[in-house]
Interface confidence: low
Amino acid sequence: GDLLIQKTIKKQVVLEEGTIAFKNWVKTGTEVYRQFWIFDVQNPQEVMMNSSNIQVKQRGPYTYRVRFLAKENVTQDAEDNTVSFLQPNGAIFEPSLSVGTEADNFTVLNLAVAAASHIYQNQFVQMILNSLINKSKSSMFQVRTLRELLWGYRDPFLSLVPYPVTTTVGLFYPYNNTADGVYKVFNGKDNISKVAIIDTYKGKRNLSYWESHCDMINGTDAASFPPFVEKSQVLQFFSSDICRSIYAVFESDVNLKGIPVYRFVLPSKAFASPVENPDNYCFCTEKIISKNCTSYGVLDISKCKEGRPVYISLPHFLYASPDVSEPIDGLNPNEEEHRTYLDIEPITGFTLQFAKRLQVNLLVKPSEKIQVLKNLKRNYIVPILWLNETGTIGDEKANMFRSQVTGKIN
């Protein structure tokens, strides 16, 4: 009996026309939502004038439906048993699942001022920037609507720059009508233990953002894993959102709508400093902000963001070192709300429920030449927002899964 089940599973998880896996893979049958909490700065003047701690108050959730578009340009390659595709991006605001509207205002760090002052550190350039910042009446902080902050706005300071620059700024700009990829993944036809594992991303096997093994594209995209998952496994996956591969480890058995699943979580060790986890040495890219690579819990992804000083962390600086969160008041990290987990059905390797949580932060540094940053006495990694992207198998799909997969085994 078991051999027959194994044979059926192996057949059905192959990524090719006609299998259960393929149908759900091309267009997810799960409704995926991305909730945002924005960190509203309560004391912008005190920070700018006195280098005070930044007082933040999270506001949210503001919810969008995402990942509702089918994969595009799906192309099988029979020669190397891969399938390539683009994952289109789209977001639809869900007012009924949100605390307010996309027109709600927030006081946040001025993204353009922080980024430009970081990228252009030459004093003459900073004099020009200062002149432009003052002329555009820009400051260290700004008031923006949710829609502007997420999806883009024309920045008044950048609009004065006399060069061919992108004057539109937004944390996820551009998003709608764009696509992630091209991904090329193994379809599992020749070797089921490689199914869904990424062969190349954007035509390459590495990212060119990191040194050594940190630069590798490992595992799947976390939507599924090769079948017959064991609790002892370390599940590797690549996330383009954080510009790196990461891993999850088994935490507990969970019953999801009558389906036994394994809950895998991202461990604190994945965010540790090289002092505690030597494997992470290549994620430490500079010595000053990281205090000689002793800080932990924040990832400098500036190389992946055209030099903009973007730092990724877990929400509320969960698993981060005290020096990171010390200049920020109003954060309350807790594992239950702020960690990332994947609930994986072990026989098929399908992720039936997940919560992907991350925080977007921007570095801002003192600058002698830029008036609005002149009074700062320390560097700040400023939280802008955190997000919770979740998906759960629907009741109908769960019934089908129980009858066709887990029911047959029990």
Epitope: Y120, F124, L129, Y163, V165, E306
Partner: nanobody, 125 residues
């Protein structure tokens, strides 16, 4: 290596005009933004004007706006600064600057750039 050579400076009466030139050699000049800076005795070097790689966008600091005009001729690898209605406070050494890091995204002034030797402009009252 890039060489920049300024010319056109001199002594002029207040209200008069001068045209500065900056000739560049050693690089594909048309790919880079160019700027003029000036340094008066005992003061820091300050920004005067800049022009994008195509000449399509220009920027002037407030004290010279409406009096100075920056332009470029990519065929001749030269950038110009036309200075009209000169004032005694315009007296300074004028330097041209070329950015070496320009990638086509964001602000091209990524490094200190290449500087010329400077040309003296003196405006007498």
């Amino acid at each position: 290596q890039v060489q920049l050579q300024e010319s056109g400076g001199g002594l002029v009466q207040a209200g008069g005009s001068l045209r500065l030139s900056c000739a560049a050699s050693g690089r594909t000049f048309s790919s880079y933004a160019m700027g003029w800076f000036r340094q008066a005795p005992g003061k820091e070097r300050e920004f005067v004007a800049a022009i994008s790689w195509s000449g399509g966008r220009t920027y002037y600091d407030d004290p010279v706006k409406g009096r100075f005009t920056i332009s470029r001729d990519n065929a001749k690898n030269t950038v110009y600064l036309q200075m009209n209605s000169l004032k005694p406070e315009d007296t300074a050494v004028y330097y041209c600057n070329l950015d070496p890091e320009y990638s086509g995204t964001w602000n091209p002034w990524a490094g200190s750039g290449y500087w010329g030797q400077g040309t003296q402009v003196t405006v007498s009252s």
